[in-house]
């Protein structure tokens, strides 16, 4: 099948570099590098850098990229984030903060702006900044279902920690449902795990964005790091290629 | 790097077949096919076929083989199974069958016979035959810990079903602990998931091996299909090669 | 995906999974494996053209990357993507053994 | 495993992951990717000898299977095993975009 020759390491590197040139453009579905004529001067906006850093950092509970990947996952995914609706919103009044649960609500019109069609969503992660924790805590994540019912999604055993740490839950399926449904506001509940015979069901873990009594600058910083959904999706204009070029090679 | 020639499909097939010859022997760490001189005549024993079929069948909750595999996983794993201690054993008297839980105990001397050293264990699955289920049920698996405490392991959402179905839980870490500890009897608890505010915590799912009032042949069939641990481990004699050839090429 | 569904029903010339059934007796001359009698091992075959050079027309080439060189290798190669294990039954002396062999069955291929 | 830990600190001649840092400006002449400035792409290189023929001495060969031809390929090939994604920031017009590119960084290789 093949006849081996002496390997020219420099040639291999050059071929790999050229292949990467094609790979990046191809993943972005660009025929050539984008024009830089309209790029505003100065550094990148803070929010963009924050989003880039969120994407770059692997966080607790997030699995490494699975292999093999479906064909559509070859292409680049645009990353956006949607912050949780702030806790002074009236939606929270319906759900009394209990000792065993906290609630997180999201505006579906913001989700739809980021991901207009359910099929475009590639991954959705709920990210929470947990503050330091003195004891081990077993927590569960629920999705708001119909009326006042909640559907169990997943759980996590949180080890004690002296420093804040980002947690990530894969909520792709849930967000895809929300995008299909078109409700106005949807939510999650984080609860202490309650065993059938245990009596102490207090949620010990402190999640950034819920601690009361903060004022001024601290509240702002706190608010920026409140729970959010990190979304990875095929951009609409790129997806239209797939809609129109659906046939197999 | 290579010069392509016309592909000779038959040559490729022959090379693949010969490579498989080496692969199988190599995975079994055999220098040549084993002698068949002492093989008893007649068909394979029932128990062996049952074990073979258990291994061959993918069951609910069992993931496909992960890639990449650690180096040691290249080699073949011997498959054995250890049945749950029968429910008339006195160990069960200490744990009153409640409406929300069932208990499953295993004899660690049987586990040790199958896997003499914890490091040899590659995978352990707890397999349960669930009988038909009318409503969706969320169940949790716990490991018996110290004294009377239980440690949460995993959970499963069971969909309604008209027919019996095998369930599988990955309990590799737990069984490895048991093999390290040298207790006499160890156990699991399968419980209904109890949410902090829910009141109905009954375990609706019927697991084969616990239903009362069976007699004669039916009880035997029932007993054969009672919960068991499916163990995959490197045989001791094969592992000794690994012990002595640990150094990198 | 270049899997058995697609490849076995097409005449794909490029990288694809190819059908190969191994009969232990006929193909390997082995009588010592009691179960199964054989298995669908399959294999990967077909070119993965290196599709980049500065004088190549960008747009034509870029559309082919996904299939022919998704990993941007200097020398892409047709290799297994999804693999499955194979349990076997054989005897050691008088004792029957059930063993599982990892990564024995090729279900799909990829250019890598 | 043939990963960066092992391969970058050894003089392995056979299949291994090799170091390659791509600087977008220097290597590709690109100024349009604003973050990162470059990344460790790496690549796989090195022979995976086909190690089976009926006249080969069984025992010597069998020990080498694990490394050189674990998938029992007719023509084993050195390819990526573990890959990682790369997020980038670039502009489309005046709008900054963060996108994640899958399988861009080679962490380890295997003969397949």
């Amino acid at each position: 099948l093949s006849t081996c020759k002496t390997i020219d390491m420099e040639l291999v590197k050059r071929k790999r570099i050229e292949a990467i040139r094609g790979q990046i453009l191809s993943k972005l579905r660009l025929a050539s590098p984008p024009s830089q004529g309209e790029v505003p001067p100065g550094p990148l906006p803070e929010a963009v850098l924050a989003l880039y850093n969120s994407t770059r950092d692997r966080v607790a509970g997030e699995s490494a990229e699975p292999e093999p990947e479906p064909e559509a996952d070859y292409y680049a995914k645009e990353v956006t984030r949607v912050l949780m609706v702030e806790t002074h919103n009236e939606i929270y009044d319906k759900f009394k903060q209990s000792t065993h649960s906290i609630y997180m609500f999201f505006n579906t019109s913001e989700l739809r702006e980021a991901v207009p069609e359910p099929v475009l969503l590639s991954r959705a992660e709920l990210r929470l900044l947990r503050l330091k924790l003195k004891v081990e805590q077993h927590v569960e994540l629920y999705q708001k279902y119909s009326n006042n019912s909640w559907r169990y999604l997943s759980n996590r055993l949180l080890a004690p920690s002296d420093s804040p740490e980002w947690l990530s839950f894969d909520v792709t399926g849930v967000v895809r449902q929300w995008l299909s449904r078109g409700g106005e506001i949807e939510g999650f509940r984080l609860s202490a795990h309650c065993s059938c015979d245990s009596r102490d069901n207090t949620l010990q873990v402190d999640i950034n964005g819920f601690t009361t009594g903060r004022r001024g600058d601290l509240a702002t910083i706190h608010g920026m790091n409140r729970p959010f959904l990190l979304l990875m999706a095929t951009p609409l204009e790129r997806a239209q290629h797939l809609q129109s070029s659906r046939h197999r090679r | 790097l290579s010069t392509c020639k016309t592909i000779d499909m038959e040559l490729v097939k022959r090379k693949r077949i010969e490579a498989i010859r080496g692969q199988i022997l190599s995975k079994l760490r055999l220098a040549s096919p084993p002698s068949q001189g002492e093989v008893p005549p007649g068909p394979l024993p029932e128990a062996v076929l049952a074990l073979y079929n258990s291994t061959r069948d993918r069951v609910a909750g069992e993931s496909a083989e992960p890639e990449p595999e650690p180096e040691a996983d290249y080699y073949a794993k011997e498959v054995t199974r250890v049945l749950m201690v029968e429910t008339h054993n006195e160990i069960y008297d200490k744990f009153k069958q409640s409406t929300h839980s069932i208990y499953m105990f295993f004899n660690t001397s049987e586990l040790r016979e199958a896997v003499p050293e914890p490091v040899l264990l590659s995978r352990a699955e707890l397999r349960l035959l669930r009988l038909k289920l009318k409503v969706e049920q969320h169940v949790e698996l716990y490991q018996k810990y110290s004294n009377n405490s239980w440690r949460y392991l995993s959970n499963r959402l069971l969909a309604p079903s008209d027919s019996p179905e095998w369930l599988s839980f990955d309990v590799t870490g737990v069984v490895r602990q048991w093999l390290s500890r040298g207790g006499e009897i160890e156990g699991f608890r399968l419980s209904a998931h109890c949410s902090c505010d829910s009141r109905d915590n009954t375990l609706q799912v019927d697991i084969n091996g616990f239903t009362t009032g069976r007699r004669g042949d039916l009880a035997t069939i029932h007993g054969m299909n009672r919960p068991f641990l499916l163990l995959m481990a490197t045989p001791l004699e094969r592992a000794q090669h690994l012990q002595s050839s640990r150094h990198r090429r | 995906a270049l899997d058995t569904n697609y490849c076995f029903s097409s005449t794909e010339k490029n990288c694809c999974v190819r059908q190969l059934y191994i009969d232990f007796r006929k193909d390997l001359g082995w009588k010592w494996i009691h179960e199964p009698k054989g298995y669908h091992a399959n294999f990967c075959l077909g070119p993965c053209p290196y599709i980049w050079s500065l004088d190549t027309q960008y747009s034509k080439v870029l559309a082919l990357y996904n299939q022919h060189n998704p990993g941007a290798s200097a020398a892409p190669c047709c290799v297994p993507q999804a693999l499955e294990p194979l349990p076997i039954v054989y005897y050691v002396g008088r004792k029957p053994k059930v063993e599982q062999l990892s990564n024995m069955i090729v279900r799909s291929c990829k250019c890598s | 495993a043939l990963d960066t830990n092992y391969c970058f600190s050894s003089t392995e001649k056979n299949c291994c992951v090799r170091q390659l840092y791509i600087d977008f400006r220097k290597d590709l002449g690109w100024k349009w990717i604003h973050e990162p400035k470059g990344y460790h792409a790496n690549f796989c290189l090195g022979p995976c000898p086909y190690i089976w023929s009926l006249d080969t001495q069984y025992s010597k060969v069998l020990a080498l299977y694990n490394q050189h031809n674990p998938g029992a390929s007719a023509a084993p090939c050195c390819v990526p095993q573990a890959l990682e994604p790369l997020p980038i920031v670039y502009y489309v017009g005046r709008k900054p975009k963060v996108e994640q590119l899958s399988n861009m960084i080679v962490r380890s290789c295997k003969c397949s």
């Epitope: 479906p70 559509a72 702006e113 099929v119 895809r176 809609q243 197999r248 | - | - | -």
Partner: antibody, heavy 115, light 112 residues
Framework: EVKLQESGPGLVAPSQSLSITCTVS????????VSWVRQPPGKGLEWLGI???????IYQSGLISRLSISKDDSKSQVFLKLSSLQTDDTATYYC?????????WGQGTSVTVSS | DIVLTQSPSSLAVSAGEKVTMNCKSS????????????LAWYQQKPGQSPKLLIY???TRESGVPDRFTGSGSGTDFTLTISSVQAEDLAVYYC????????FGGGTKLEIK
């Protein structure tokens, strides 16, 4: 070429369950969704449910307790199961490839619920 | 649930004439942030399965003749056939995907 083919039992007795298989070719079930739609004789179309590429399912609210959709990606098959059938479940059942919209449909399989 | 009402329920026109049919939604189908309406039109010829004509209220599916045009926004939508052909004999359904998926009752087009 994209193709979808439904196969079902034709006749089902009341109170029994209906199982239909949709076998697809020309696209991957890991990338696209598949919707199920039915059409009673001489009437309009009714969406029943969808299974997305990642396995997420969504059902019409009126059928949640009776409907189940699953799939086998490796066999390129999608399965519909509808339990406790009544005579008004008599219809032609279609599966459709779902991207932004239902862009390719199978020919449909006719199901009659009758004793 | 969103209800779609189609009018007229049937109409008969001669070949070559222009025809319009309407679809009214019980709530807005417009995603104002991306300026797209979640409405599609399907054609079902006698004895056949439905076929996609238009999505996002006005985007024509590839391969659909340009005599078919979709328009409207919010709650009121129209399908226009500029010059009816004999092969356009069919029932036309609108479908919303703003909140799950529901179809209108259909408009039956007959050719005089």
């Amino acid at each position: 070429e994209v193709k979808l083919q439904e196969s079902g039992p034709g006749l089902v007795a009341p109170s029994q369950s209906l199982s239909i298989t949709c076998t697809v070719s020309g696209f991957s079930l890991t990338t696209y969704g598949v919707s199920w739609v039915r059409q009673p004789p001489g009437k309009g179309l009714e969406w029943l449910g969808i299974i997305w590429g990642d396995g997420t399912t969504i059902y019409q609210s009126g059928l949640i307790s009776r409907l189940s959709i699953s799939k086998d990606d490796s066999k390129s098959q999608v399965f519909l199961k509808l339990s406790s059938l009544q005579t008004d479940d008599t219809a032609t059942y279609y599966c459709a490839k779902h991207y932004f919209v239902m862009d390719y449909w199978g020919q449909g399989t006719s199901v009659t619920v009758s004793s | 649930d969103i209800v779609l009402t189609q009018s007229p329920s049937s109409l008969a026109v001669s070949a070559g004439e222009k025809v319009t049919m309407n679809c009214k939604s019980s709530q807005s189908l417009l995603n104002s942030r991306i300026r797209k309406n979640y409405l599609a039109w399907y054609q079902q010829k006698p004895g056949q399965s439905p076929k996609l004509l238009i999505y996002w209220a006005s985007t024509r599916e590839s391969g659909v003749p340009d005599r078919f045009t979709g328009s409207g926004s919010g709650t009121d939508f129209t399908l226009t056939i500029s010059s009816v052909q004999a092969e356009d004999l069919a029932v036309y359904y609108c479908k919303q995907s703003y909140n799950l998926w529901t179809f209108g009752g259909g408009t039956k087009l007959e050719i005089k």
